[in-house]
């Protein structure tokens, strides 16, 4: 059967800080999260079956003044979907997206979402992971911050 | 086999100008770029097989103050994915996306990404192309600016 | 045959106001809009066949000064793609996206687009609907505001 995964953010374990970090805590078996013929391990989505896959990610950032002041009003809110090959230890960014934002103290609430998607050849054993900037601003809802993949066709 | 394409921007040949410009230089056979049972010619992705396809585009714009001043702080950053039918010479926009942005001189770096996607009936010979505003601001990385398509099913 | 739908906004019947509302008027059989083995009824996309589907939405908002002043310059421009189960009367958000925006009176035109997409298990009889904030700002073009789904695989 065709492999797929839809992984939703595990909000109990979001890293702090504003730098670029790899998100390693995702749900794979609760709510909308699910996986079949792929493996989730050590924060990475592992390919078990060669093929062409459509990969996607939706990342939401938010801040409310009740959470305290931001360190800066100028933010880079970014996502990077990366592929790591174990055989040849290397990591490459497949997709990136985001925006610089001016989240002024004049507004009590701020929100921003990023969506990226693309069609990629993946080999068994390769690993997909998601990095973001400003992880402390991530929206922890399962409808907000997630990534996934589904196999579309075999490699000829 | 099911047709697909994932085309990444060819940064050596990005047009100048600002208004709505068709992007004609894309890679189809290096890095993440690939194509099968579709044709890339004259800056357009040509359909070789009737079917229903999922089309997508990811377009990133960026500016750093070291590149010089912008003409204006108010920008329209837009993408249009269009379909052209040769038999009936006509061009129609399938998908559009983007944002007006205020890229203030108070910040040294600016970034913004657009993602669009949709499911469309395409006939053999029809051509898909991508137009953007402000092409001089395009991010030339293969993970940043790309578009693609993959066939999902036949037309009944 | 694999079910799919691509529904485009019916601009003759967009709700007014700035609150969160369900969009119930969509085209399913004109221009780019189409449907097969799914049903559109009462503003909802009804699943007729169990399966895993890729769902997507593209929502564009715009405002021109000729339309008159906005009530506020600080806006929440949001989309929510929801699933309703009739058997167990409940509604759940599958995907959300959007941004808070500062649409200053210093610019004569404003535009912003949201794209969301994800892979979900849908059962026959379940209904997909789209809610947005600020519906009066929706771009009524078929290339701008649409949502859709296509079946990728059966449930094992």
């Amino acid at each position: 059967a065709q492999p797929f995964a839809h992984l939703t953010i595990n909000a109990t374990n979001i890293p702090t800080g504003s730098h670029k970090v790899s998100l390693s805590s995702w749900y794979h078996d609760r709510g909308w999260a699910k996986i079949s013929n792929m493996t989730f391990s050590n924060g990475k989505l592992i390919v078990n079956q060669d093929g062409f896959y459509y990969l996607y990610a939706n990342i939401c950032f938010r801040h409310h003044e009740t959470s305290g002041d931001l360190a800066t009003e100028y933010l880079q809110l970014m996502v990077y979907v990366t592929k790591t090959s174990i055989k040849i230890p290397s990591s490459h960014t497949l997709m990136k997206g985001g925006s610089t934002k001016y989240w002024s103290g004049n507004s009590e609430f701020h929100f921003y979402s990023i969506n990226v998607g693309g069609f990629f050849k993946l080999r068994s054993g390769e690993e997909i992971s998601v990095e973001v900037s400003n992880p402390s601003l991530l929206d922890p809802d399962q409808d907000a911050t997630y990534f996934g993949a589904f196999k579309v066709r075999d490699i000829d | 086999a099911q047709p697909f394409a994932h085309l990444t921007i060819n940064a050596t040949n990005i047009p100048t100008g600002s208004h709505k410009v068709s992007l004609s230089s894309w890679y189809h056979d290096r890095g993440w770029a690939k194509i099968s049972n579709m044709t890339f010619s004259n800056g357009k992705l040509i359909v070789n097989q009737d079917g229903f396809y999922y089309l997508y585009a990811n377009i990133c714009f960026r500016h750093h103050e070291t590149s010089g001043d912008l003409a204006t702080e108010y920008l329209q950053l837009m993408v249009y994915v269009t379909k052209t039918s040769i038999k009936i010479p006509s061009s129609h926009t399938l998908m559009k996306g983007g944002s007006t942005k205020y890229w203030s001189g108070n910040s040294e770096f600016h970034f913004y990404s657009i993602n669009v996607g949709g499911f469309f009936k395409l006939r053999s010979g029809e051509e898909i192309s991508v137009e953007v505003s402000n092409p001089s601001l395009l991010d030339p990385d293969q993970d940043a600016t790309y578009f693609g398509a993959f066939k999902v099913r036949d037309i009944d | 045959a694999q079910p799919f739908a691509h529904l485009t906004i019916n601009a003759t019947n967009i709700p007014t106001g700035s609150h969160k509302v369900s969009l119930s008027s969509w085209y399913h059989d004109r221009g780019w809009a189409k449907i097969s083995n799914m049903t559109f009824s009462n503003g909802k996309l009804i699943v007729n066949q169990d399966g895993f589907y890729y769902l997507y939405a593209n929502i564009c908002f715009r405002h021109h000064e000729t339309s008159g002043d906005l009530a506020t310059e600080y806006l929440q421009l949001m989309v929510y793609v929801t699933k309703t189960s009739i058997k167990i009367p409940s509604s759940h958000t599958l995907m959300k996206g959007g941004s808070t925006k500062y649409w200053s009176g210093n610019s004569e035109f404003h535009f912003y687009s949201i794209n969301v997409g994800g892979f979900f298990k849908l059962r026959s009889g379940e209904e997909i609907s789209v809610e947005v904030s600020n519906p009066s700002l929706l771009d009524p073009d078929q290339d701008a505001t649409y949502f859709g789904a296509f079946k990728v695989r059966d449930i094992d």
Epitope: - | T16, S18, H19, A71, T72, Q76, S136 | -
Partner: nanobody
Framework: EVQLVESGGGLVQAGGSLRLTCAAS????????MGWFRQAPGKEREFVAA????????NYADSVKGRFTISRDNAKNTLYLQMNSLEPEDTAVYYC????????????????????WGQGTQVTVSS
């Protein structure tokens, strides 16, 4: 909306100088690219000069390069065109314009880049 009002035109002998002023009101002047265009009797309106929002970059038509200087004072919401070594061929109605949306200053040598226009001021250069 941005309102633009030109002034400073008049009659001058060849070789003389004039300084045109464009006063802006309404929106935030400093965020717009600004330009000067001119239209001679019986001719199309043509580009003269453009300046970016900060005043740090300028662009000129070949016919006025080295003779005309565009500048702006964002604190005063004012655009200027200093015209030296005037020639009879410079006779025209001069218009100032404001535009936004596009990053490349070269685009502001085209009329379609601009949203707002003034009513114009007449410049006549006699031989």
């Amino acid at each position: 909306e941005v309102q633009l009002v030109e002034s400073g035109g008049g009659l001058v002998q060849a070789g003389g100088s004039l300084r045109l002023t464009c006063a802006a009101s309404g929106r935030t002047f400093r965020s717009y690219a600004m330009g000067w265009f001119r239209q001679a009797p019986g001719k199309e309106r043509e580009f003269v000069a453009a300046i970016n929002y900060s005043g740090g970059s300028t662009n000129y038509a070949d016919s006025v390069k080295g003779r005309f200087t565009i500048s702006r004072d964002n604190a005063k919401n004012t655009l200027y065109l200093q015209m030296n070594s005037l020639e009879p061929e410079d006779t025209a109605v001069y218009y100032c314009a404001a535009g936004s949306g596009y990053a490349s200053l070269s685009y502001y040598s085209t009329e379609r880049a601009y949203t707002y226009w003034g009513q114009g001021t007449q410049v006549t250069v006699s031989s």
